[in-house]
Amino acid sequence: IWELKKDVYVVELDWYPDAPGEMVVLTCDTPEEDGITWTLDQSSEVLGSGKTLTIQVKEFGDAGQYTCHKGGEVLSHSLLLLHKKEDGIWSTDILKDQKEPKNKTFLRCEAKNYSGRFTCWWLTTISTDLTFSVKSSRGSSDPQGVTCGAATLSAERVRGDNKEYEYSVECQEDSACPAAEESLPIEVMVDAVHKLKYENYTSSFFIRDIIKPDPPKNLQLKPLKNSRQVEVSWEYPDTWSTPHSYFSLTFCVQVQGKSKREKKDRVFTDKTSATVICRKNASISVRAQDRYYSSSWSEWASVPCS
Amino acid sequence: RAVPGGSSPAWTQCQQLSQKLCTLAWSAHPLVGHMDLREEGDEETTNDVPHIQCGDGCDPQGLRDNSQFCLQRIHQGLIFYEKLLGSDIFTGEPSLLPDSPVGQLHASLLGLSQLLQPEGHHWETQQIPSLSPSQPWQRLLLRFKILRSLQAFVAVAARVFAHGAATLSP
């Protein structure tokens, strides 16, 4: 058993049929010695008396808010949560496996630049009695500070018969060094509590591996005289690291109709302009990627050919 | 050339060669990018490799103030990786094909280090750690980790030279 926060404790249980469970001793936080009784949740049934209560925690029915009282007055609470371990593996019932970029990916994180700011998100089908708490650091043995905000519900989607909820959190490394080569990964730890179930999820990454620039901005077209060709120009996204002579991007320019199966023109360039062939009812799209490190491409920025 | 006396390197040549190093580092093992090597316990490998750190002057302001600190750090790293790629980690079993991207990578690391430090000038270099894995599978894993680390190192070096070529070239 360990303390998650004040008056909230996590009991770690091996979860299998007829498991013996864990013996837990609760102590009432009071100078009083006599006339103390214990109850669980809203029940008025007295579970025991005395300053301490010893219980055998085996299942969710044994978890909850234990309260010690004296003469009708509440002295203190202890909330017990369960953390299940099945076949040596901690349960992951609360969050959905996003399966990208690999199986058992519960947390996904992205950064728009090298400033040390990043966003992580996760999915669940649970809509109520759900809380998250996020901590982060650079490295684990001698951790350097990363400050995370509160996790918020960022999107709701309908998937078949189920509703899916996306939560996200923004974090910022306290002393980021955008130009340095990272040697210690960022660690992100998410505590998830659903009713009386506790689970924790972690992710470890270098900022360079989660970079995904915003799409290029200000796409403009200039038709070339006596030609089917069009010069398309664009700018670096505002959110990308500066100076651009140091933090350079490379670009993919594509002309395509509405359907992915339609024919297309495609060219890669390090410049912020390119010459392509525009077709009626097609769009010109441009996306960006770090020039020197193969992290994710940005989403496409598009303008119609016409 | 970035000689210890403090003259400027051939920024444009260094830029071209460092960009080539980036391409080579990713083509030497593109799948490295899809392996989560941190799960394999990185400490003994990548903690020993020279990283370009915050105080090394490789940021745009540091380069403007005095590029020598950064160039020396890059040179150290190039020599270090060049030695690693020439060591039995890469020459032992399972054997790499001759003329593989690793071979070209090795040659290009040497080429860039020589551009930075001509014959007769010497910056101190970092000792290469004694990493001699006994099993072929350990060697393979170590290769992946070294290449992954090299990808990060040459990306920073390429940024430095691109910025230098754009803003510091005479």
Partner: antibody, heavy 118, light 107 residues
């Protein structure tokens, strides 16, 4: 199977005009760009130009501008290359090539040898 | 126009050898480079697109690398059917241009 079948070899006199064809099958003709590429005897490949069969748009290499005309007939799924004012240096194998992507060549015809000789 | 220079113009090799052909562009073309194989009397065949992207149906012994101005095509463990002429082609800008070709012949 995507296929391009070209018309047979031609022998022409200098100053004449020749029109060679390229019949597409195995795909929707207007879904691919169609290019023509020249290969002179014992020489390399030279891109001549392309056509978008969907709308008839064409683009030619400056070297071949005025010398060649590329057309397409969507009713017969056939592309054409017309070469005018033939000279002996126009003796070559002419390939049609197609792709959904404009700038490289995924599918090739078997080639048509045009010989210009007096 | 962008000039493409291939080297060597010919190379002699044996079955099982590893062969590398290089292609240099007269200006930077990013990764807009493609490789073709042509056997005598036949049309060219696409091997690699955008410098390093493999083409389905092409044996994995063919690999490409490069960006900017310098590119290479490597054939690992040369097979009897690989003796042919190889061309690079840039697609950075029109007119599209090819390298002069490299003939891989039997030693």
């Amino acid at each position: 199977e995507v296929q391009l079948v070209q018309s047979g070899a031609e022998v022409k006199k200098p100053g004449a005009t020749v029109k060679i064809s390229c019949k597409a099958s195995g795909y929707t003709f207007s879904d691919y760009y169609l290019h023509w590429v020249r290969q002179r005897p014992e020489k390399g490949l030279e891109w001549m130009g392309w056509i978008d069969p969907e709308n008839g748009d064409t683009e030619y290499a400056p070297k071949f501008q005025g010398k060649v005309t590329i057309t397409a007939d969507t009713s017969t799924d056939t592309g054409y290359l017309e070469l005018s004012s033939l000279r002996s240096e126009d003796t070559a194998v002419y390939y049609c090539a197609a792709n959904k992507e404009l700038r490289y060549f995924d599918v090739w015809g078997q080639g048509t040898l045009v010989t210009v000789s007096s | 126009d962008i000039q493409m220079t291939q080297s060597p113009s010919s190379v002699s090799a044996s079955v099982g050898d590893r062969v590398t052909i290089t292609c240099r562009a007269s200006q930077s073309i990013s990764i807009n480079l493609h490789w073709y194989q042509q056997k005598p009397g036949k049309a060219p065949k696409l091997l690699i697109k955008f410098a390093s992207q493999s083409i389905s149906g092409v044996p994995s012994r063919f690999s490409g690398y490069g960006s900017g101005t310098d590119f290479s095509l490597t054939i690992n463990s040369l097979q009897p059917e690989d003796f042919a002429r190889y061309y690079c082609q840039q697609s950075n800008s029109f007119p599209l241009t090819f390298g002069g070709g490299t003939k891989v012949e039997i030693k």
